[in-house]
């Protein structure tokens, strides 16, 4: 199996009540605007065939995509939560910048690509869905990276 290195976040990142609350409030506001309840972006399918030791690397890819392709372009919306949460998630992304996998990561990229394709196919409603799942992103990062 591929070896992942530097794929760790300190648990203190996930033990800050204020920013955790803001992240969940942002997700809640966006999910109220999400009328496509049939599709789930962050779920069992995302982790299919990915070992526990590789999951932080996978979540790093999802986090970077969410920031660059969803949150930054949509960052004028869902105030005041967005302007508080984006720097926090950008900080987590920065802390995972040295998280790499030695070896083949094609199976991980395939799963992440499916998520990306789903968001792109749904257009703006896909972006809103991704924001609405920030609580799941937060929890998945926590479970995979600490």
């Amino acid at each position: 199996a591929p070896i992942s290195s530097h794929c760790r976040l300190d648990k203190s990142n996930f033990q800050q009540p204020y920013i955790t609350n803001r992240t969940f409030m942002l997700a809640k506001e966006a999910s109220l605007a999400d009328n496509n309840t049939d599709v789930r972006l962050i779920g069992e399918k995302l982790f299919h065939g990915v070992s526990m030791s590789e999951r932080c690397y996978l979540m790093k890819q999802v986090l970077n995509f969410t920031l660059e392709e969803v949150l930054f372009p949509q960052s004028d919306r869902f105030q005041p939560y967005m302007q508080e949460v984006v720097p926090f998630l950008a900080r987590l992304s920065n802390r995972l910048s040295t998280c790499h996998i030695e070896g083949d990561d094609l199976h991980i990229q395939r799963n992440v690509q499916k998520l990306k394709d789903t968001v792109k196919k749904l257009g703006e409603s896909g972006e809103i869905k991704a924001i609405g799942e920030l609580d799941l992103l937060f929890m998945s990062l926590r479970n995979a990276c600490i």
Epitope: Q16, Y18, I19, Q83, F88
Partner: antibody, heavy 120, light 111 residues
């Protein structure tokens, strides 16, 4: 370290003024930039914000129609332009980066302020 | 214009406890977005003192604390010191205006 450096004092006869705020020490596009003003001996007044990533700006109702906030990401600088100046626009204008409300570096970074004096 | 109302001035002797109130409405404090407090020492830029009702940024002494109830918030300072003499402002998101609003400001005098 994180720093905001503002342009120097301005004395204006009443047309318009453009104040600059150069950011350093952090990723400019990750944090909203707010503008706040304070007239001599008065309280703080929120003018608006700009999102440096999108360039989208939002202004307090009082200033809509005569304030414009822009940014130049190539030089990490935010600008605030106020037009149709009146004597009651005489104030110190501050830029302030959206505070981090997480981690051990929580706090807000402010510029030192630009004094704008409107006089005929 | 939505306003967050504060007493114009409060005073206290060294080592005493003082509180500064901030009264709003259902569109700002009552909407539950979280109240922030700023301290402005004479001739300087404001400094974030409390965020999200009761959280202290690193470096802010635990003599400063914040609380919120209904449409009002308050800042408490215990063990008052000469260097606490400053102006204090509450700051909040106002949902009706879709923007931030500062309180009217309170001047604290240490006797």
């Amino acid at each position: 370290q994180v720093q905001l450096v503002q342009s120097g004092a301005e004395k204006k006869p009443g047309a318009s003024v453009k104040v600059s705020c150069k950011a350093s020490g952090y990723t400019f596009t990750d944090y909203y930039m707010h503008w706040v003003r304070q007239a001599p001996g008065q309280g703080l007044e929120w003018v608006g914000w700009i999102n440096p990533y999108t360039g989208g700006a939002f202004y307090a109702q009082k200033f809509r129609g005569r304030v414009t906030m822009t940014r130049d990401t190539s030089i990490n600088t935010a600008y605030m332009e106020l037009s149709r100046l009146g004597s009651d626009d005489t104030a110190v204008y501050y830029c302030a980066r959206e505070p981090e409300r997480f981690g051990d570096s929580t706090g807000q970074v402010w510029g030192r302020g630009t004094m704008v004096t409107v006089s005929s | 214009q939505a306003v967050l109302t504060q007493p114009s001035s409060v005073s206290g002797a060294p080592r005493q406890r003082v509180t500064i109130s901030c009264t709003g409405s259902s569109s700002n404090i009552g909407a539950g977005y979280g109240v922030h407090w700023y301290q402005q020492l004479p001739g300087t830029a404001p400094k974030l003192l409390i965020y999200g009702n009761s959280n202290r940024p690193s470096g802010v002494p635990d003599r400063f604390s914040g609380s919120k109830s209904g449409t009002s918030a308050s800042l408490a300072i215990t063990g008052l010191q000469a260097e606490d003499e400053a102006d204090y402002y509450c700051y909040h998101w106002d949902k009706e205006q879709s923007g931030y609003v500062f309180g009217t400001g309170t001047q604290l005098t240490v006797l």
